[in-house]
Amino acid sequence: AMHVAQPAVVLASSRGIASFVCEYASPGKATEVRVTVLRQADSQVTEVCAATYMMGNELTFLDDSICTGTSSGNQVNLTIQGLRAMDTGLYICKVELMYPPPYYLGIGNGTQIYVIDPEPCPDSD
Amino acid sequence: AMHVAQPAVVLASSRGIASFVCEYASPGKATEVRVTVLRQADSQVTEVCAATYMMGNELTFLDDSICTGTSSGNQVNLTIQGLRAMDTGLYICKVELMYPPPYYLGIGNGTQIYVIDPEPCPDSD
């Protein structure tokens, strides 16, 4: 399996934005790469977002995705937004080298993202 | 050494308040107990606050302390307030059984407290 590295812990900003780098040890020069972010909480795993990109191009997530990202070589800079305290959990980076063959798969150990809901601002009178 | 348990991770609220339980496996019923909170960051250890209490009584920290607490049996419920993002670090609970003899000492593995500074509220016009 391909090695994927990601930070152990990230704190979301008070605006609910968390960013982290997902780095994969590519065994060759892939031209087409797929990155998927999975969330694991209470032993449940759900897909947060996914993007397929051509090396050298931008990552393109779906329009309604809570993720954005950029790539540079074997590194993908991922940003997840709109996070609330209830979204605290382990976010796992999954990388697939889709083309050319052979297919490679790598799964990181996960990044624990902690989210704290902000206090509401006082009403302006 | 006496065993001391504390949670691995705690998130401070957006108001900069963090609470955690420090539990010690007492060899019996001490009548006088001292609890100290130490902060470890960048290999530096500093004392955050300390209180000596008689079993069954409230913990009394100094008036200007950032800590408050309550005790119940072999558990101490600690609250640290006024935390800022720069205060993120490992907070270690140290428990000493002062009386009756012999003296017992226990030091926990530390609680990583994460603090995120809130976004300022917009000015009210």
Partner: antibody, heavy 118, light 107 residues
Framework: QVQLQESGPGLVKPSQTLSLTCAVS?????????WNWIRQPPGKGLEWIGY???????YYNPSLKSRITISRDTSKNQFSLKLSSVTAVDTAVYYC???????????WGQGTTVTVSS | DIVMTQSPDSLAVSLGERATINCKAS??????VAWYQQKPGQPPKLLIY???YRYSGVPDRFSGSGSGTDFTLTISSLQAEDVAVYYC?????????FGQGTKLEIK
């Protein structure tokens, strides 16, 4: 490493006083802890008798209180049990043991068997 | 006095199997419960204190749980040397009291 060793007569006549001593090595009995007597009748469970504290304080099991005296000799680093007016029901293995105040027993003597019989 | 009642009085378990001994206190004793192992001709030996903490040198197959009035000693995989009588002990309140003992044998 603290060590406790009981000693005393193995046979006591009914109505007499049972006297046992526990010699402690490796720790001064006046420095800390509470120094206890516990007994175990043949084939039965454990019964706590009482303690003498590092400070000379005493506490006895209410069920035996009227017949018990626990004392100490700090110069010899030992403590003793006297149980008066014994009957056959006091036949038991008698252990000395150490604990923190109202705590578990972390060190025990090997025990000494006392038989009450005429 | 606080009465500590153990169940069962005796227990036969196969080698490698799990053994569970229960202890019920007549009133709340918090977590102030210890467990001892006693082999013939020997004094009791401390296994567990504060309900769930293993004493120094005690194998990790021994574990304790519970709080309040109900407590359990578990031996995860019975070994031949575990054959003994086991006692629970409350040290919440004087006079200190023990359970009546549970005799553990190999099936």
């Amino acid at each position: 490493q603290v060590q406790l060793q009981e000693s005393g007569p193995g046979l006591v006549k009914p109505s007499q006083t049972l006297s046992l001593t526990c010699a402690v090595s490796g720790y001064s009995i006046s420095s800390g802890y509470y120094w206890n007597w516990i007994r175990q009748p043949p084939g039965k469970g454990l019964e706590w008798i009482g303690y003498i504290g590092y400070d000379g304080s005493n506490y006895y099991n209410p069920s035996l209180k009227s017949r018990i005296t626990i004392s100490r000799d700090t110069s010899k680093n030992q403590f003793s049990l006297k149980l008066s007016s014994v009957t056959a029901v006091d036949t038991a293995v008698y252990y000395c043991a150490r604990n923190y105040y109202s705590g578990y027993f972390d060190s025990w003597g090997q025990g000494t068997t006392v038989t009450v019989s005429s | 006095d606080i009465v500590m009642t153990q169940s069962p009085d005796s227990l036969a378990v196969s080698l490698g199997e799990r053994a569970t001994i229960n202890c019920k206190a007549s009133q709340n004793v918090g977590t102030y419960v210890a467990w001892y192992q006693q082999k013939p001709g020997q004094p009791p030996k401390l296994l567990i204190y504060s309900t769930s903490y293993r004493y120094s040198g005690v194998p990790d197959r021994f574990s304790g749980s519970g709080s309040g009035t109900d407590f359990t000693l578990t031996i995860s995989s019975l070994q031949a040397e575990d054959v003994a009588v086991y006692y629970c002990h409350q040290y919440d309140t004087y006079p200190l009291t023990f359970g009546q003992g549970t005799k553990l044998e190999i099936k």
